[in-house]
Interface confidence: low
């Protein structure tokens, strides 16, 4: 049999707080437990859910949790079912509501000396007790013509008079807690002696140095007082005014006039009406100074014929909001048609060339007018004035290719050479009119050139072939001074090019003929065996029919090429000793010797006291130091050739002699001993 060890029991619960209905079951077999609320199964939610066999409430809800709960245990095998005792919550709650007019039926019916009943719509369980307030002050029963019925939550004013005017609110409290009215009721019972608004001042916007008028009127019996204040509570009267309101005048009817308004006058003006009885009535109005800022500049616009384009005019900031309109040629644009104004936009539909020109956006308000021009260009496809022509250009001279076009706006011209875009550099220059200049024409400039002229409306192009008229020239020019090795075979080449293949011949500068052992073979001067007499001045002459002849002068020197008689050797020296690096060279002309140490030429005039280069070319270094170690290069050179040889210098510490070593023991290295 199924037995309930713990059964749910009815209990007090607080609205919105936690609660638990306990249920524990003992049975011979497995049972499943579920809950019923008023006979219907309870579905788990985040707020209300099964916790084991018990039912847990995260937040009790007076509407959803009212009713009878029952715990049911069922053996699904045998079908046996047991139900617990019924349990319910006594839910304590309090809920705010508005203060409403119960009697009379509408506010319009409230008259002095009528009965007025207000009801406090705060409800709760247990039933709360009520407290009433007027303008935040508590009201007690039987005081000043009013009755508070705690039971019916009503406040009765009998009869209601002007002194009852005010903001009515209520609060209620019970064992559960306290709540106050969510919406209060303003009772307004006219009193002839209270000031009433007849005319309220309105916000105004005025231009600088113009006048501003605020109207303000109150009525009451006896007549009310009226006072104007500005911003910082400074009173404005006709006798005393702050300096920034010296041009203010208060008229008998309450109107305030400000003349020659300036920035210091801008701000909030308060008109205060005070009756013989009742609170003051404060009305506010703001004086704004009209202002208009400058308009941003327009970028010039380029449009293409046939398209539709829009130009937006951003109105300048201003108060009041500036009005905006577009003009063209001094005429305001219409709001429809092909060229028209739409909102702040200038619209040009199916653009024609004749639409080009200056359009002006105007903006204006009380503070003044601003304008900004936009220049509209209608682009046309370029047309040819002069196409590039096939041209013969002379090598070495400037060459020009025309590409003259016209269009609106001014077209941009680019040039291509062999389909590759020409970028301007020291050799190529594109003039403003589109002409290409080749600063110094070279042979390889002979190719196809194409120019393209473009505007946003389209582009045109044309090409031309350049033929280069080659100049007669040596290729390469012979070296003006050359050396030949004595008693050896030698050749001196000379070649040239031109529009026609030139003939080349050599002759001695003095006009004498070449000796028989010297031959001139197609421009190459050949010496079978160089003699001393072969030295001298020679001329290479290149000539062709159309271009005449050119000459190159060459001075040939006969020399005995340099050889080293003595070369420096790998040398190791003790620190503090002297190193000698020998070097001797021979040749004709007699070679000069230079030394290079540690990758720098040793200048004989700047060697210092430790180094010296002898007449025969040897290098001596006294008092050597470790930093003198390194490779030393002997360089022998004359006007005909140059040779070098190198050797390393090692500087080492002198070893301390050991006891066992006799005075005649040899040093541990091959040394220079000094």
């Amino acid at each position: 049999a199924i037995v309930f060890i713990k059964q749910p029991s009815s209990q007090d619960a607080l609205q919105g707080r936690r609660a638990l209905l306990r249920c524990e079951v003992e049975a011979p077999g497995p049972v499943h437990v579920y809950w019923l609320l008023d006979g219907a199964p309870v579905q788990d939610t985040e707020r209300r859910f099964a916790q084991g066999s018990s039912l847990s409430f995260a937040a009790v809800d007076r509407l959803q949790d009212s009713g009878t709960f029952q715990c049911v245990a069922r053996d699904d095998v045998t079908g046996e079912e047991a139900r617990s005792a019924n349990a319910s919550f006594n839910i304590k709650w309090i809920e705010a509501g508005p203060v409403v007019l119960k009697h009379p039926a509408s506010e319009a019916e409230i008259q002095p000396q009528t009965q007025v009943t207000l009801r406090c719509h705060i409800d709760g369980h247990p039933r709360p007790t009520y407290q009433w307030f007027r303008d935040g002050t508590p009201l007690s029963d039987g005081q000043s013509n009013h009755t508070v019925s705690s039971k019916e939550r009503n406040l009765t004013l009998r009869p209601a008079g002007p002194e009852h005017s005010g903001l009515y609110s209520c609060c209620a409290h019970s064992a559960f807690g306290q709540a106050c009215s969510s919406q209060n009721f303003t009772l307004s019972i006219a009193d002839e002696s209270f000031a009433r608004v007849v005319l309220a001042p309105q916000d105004v916007v005025v231009a600088r140095y113009e006048e501003a008028m605020f109207h303000c009127q109150f009525s009451a019996q006896p007549p009310p007082s009226l006072q104007w204040l500005f911003e910082d509570e400074t009173p404005i009267t006709n006798r005393s005014r702050p300096p920034h309101l010296r041009r203010a005048t208060v008229f008998a009817n309450g109107s305030l006039l400000l003349t020659q308004v300036r920035p210091r006058n801008a701000g909030i003006y308060r008109c205060i009406g005070q009756g013989q009885r009742g609170p003051p009535i404060i009305l506010e109005a703001t004086l704004h100074l009209a202002e208009i800022e400058d308009m941003p500049l327009f970028e010039p616009r380029v449009f293409t014929a046939g398209s539709e384009e829009r130009v937006t005019c951003l109105p300048p900031k201003g108060l009041p909001e500036p009005s905006v309109w577009w003009e063209h040629a001094g005429v305001r644009l219409p709001t429809h048609g092909r060229v028209y104004q739409k909102g702040h936009e200038l619209v040009l539909a199916n653009i024609a060339e004749s639409d080009a020109g200056v359009y002006t956006c105007h903006a204006a308000n009380l503070a003044g007018q601003r304008r900004q021009d936009v220049n509209i260009t209608v682009a046309t496809v370029p047309s040819w004035l002069k196409k590039p022509q096939d041209s013969q250009l002379e090598e070495g001279k400037p060459g020009y290719l025309d590409c003259l076009t016209q269009a609106t706006p001014k077209p941009t011209v680019v040039w291509y050479r062999n389909q590759m875009l020409i970028s301007e550099d020291s050799r190529f220059e594109v003039f403003k009119n589109g002409t290409l200049r080749i600063n110094s024409v070279e042979v390889y400039d002979g190719t196809w050139y194409r120019c393209m002229s473009s505007t946003p409306a389209g582009s045109i192009e044309a090409q031309a072939r350049v033929q280069v008229l080659e100049k007669l020239k040596f290729t390469p020019p012979p070296q003006p001074q050359q050396c030949m090795e004595f008693d050896k075979e030698a050749t001196v080449p000379c070649s040239a090019t031109g529009r026609e293949k030139p003939t080349i011949k050599w002759e001695r500068a003095d006009g004498s003929s070449l000796p028989e052992w010297v031959t001139d073979n197609a421009g190459t001067l050949h010496f079978a065996r160089v003699t001393r007499d072969d030295a001298g001045n020679y001329t290479c002459i290149a000539s062709n029919g159309p271009q005449g002849q050119i000459r190159a002068h060459v001075q040939l020197t006969v020399a005995v090429f340099i050889t080293f008689k003595v070369e420096p050797e790998r040398t190791t020296v003790y620190q503090g000793h002297t190193a000698l690096l020998q070097c001797e060279a021979q040749g004709d002309p007699k070679p000069l010797i230079q030394w290079k140490g540690k990758d720098r030429i040793l200048d004989p005039t700047k060697l210092g006291p430790r180094m010296h280069i002898f007449q025969n070319g040897s290098l001596v270094i006294h008092d050597v130091a470790p930093e003198d170690s390194g490779r030393y290069t002997c360089i022998a050179g004359n006007s005909c050739n140059i040779k070098h040889t190198e050797a390393p210098l090692y500087v080492v510490d002198k070893p301390v002699p050991e006891e066992s070593e006799g005075p005649g023991s040899p040093p541990p290295y091959k040394m220079i001993q000094t």
Partner: antibody, heavy 118, light 113 residues
Amino acid sequence: EVKLLESGGGLVQPGGSLKLSCAASGFDFSKDWMSWVRQAPGKGLEWIGEINPDSRTINYAPSLKDKFIISRENAKNTLYLQMSKVRSEDTALYYCARWDYDGGMDYWGQGTSVTVSS
Amino acid sequence: DIVMTQSPSSLSVSAGEKVTMSCKSSQSLLNGGNQQNSLAWYQQKPGQPPKLLIYGASTRESGVPDRFTGSGSGTDFALTISSVQAEDLAVYYCQNDHTYPYTFGGGTELEIK
């Protein structure tokens, strides 16, 4: 005792910016119009601009309105002058002053010196 | 802008003498609202900030000695020191307090002989 104390001056390079402050005490700062006035070395007084109590109205000398910005923080009783794009001709002693409601500027600070030089 | 012109630019007097300096405005400073002239006079002693002497063209600021008198209306104004004292050595400036921008005159330097 009414006191106005300017600070923030110093050496600034041409084209640079600087923000001057004016600390007020001894009166109800939040209810008064305030002004900045400057005086170049050996020269006369030049009115820079003014600001109303709630910062809704700020006026500048026309020649300076694109360079200078006047502001105030009533909670801190402080008036500010933000200077930008300064040039050598902006070298001067800068004073803050209170507008008297009856007319004129009745209280002045001792001034803070601004030198524009490269 | 209203231009304020002061003359002379400097003057030298002995202690005890009476001195008058002039200030002319390019527009009338008469305030139609209260029939007051919106002009202020300031004194600036060497190394000191300016000090308000006169407002409304003729009203002395509290604490200012009665030897200082402001006069004039419309566009012509004057500041008179009835008996100059050594401590009056200063530059005197007039200011348009009528129309923004509130321009100052170039100043009159008073030297004591």
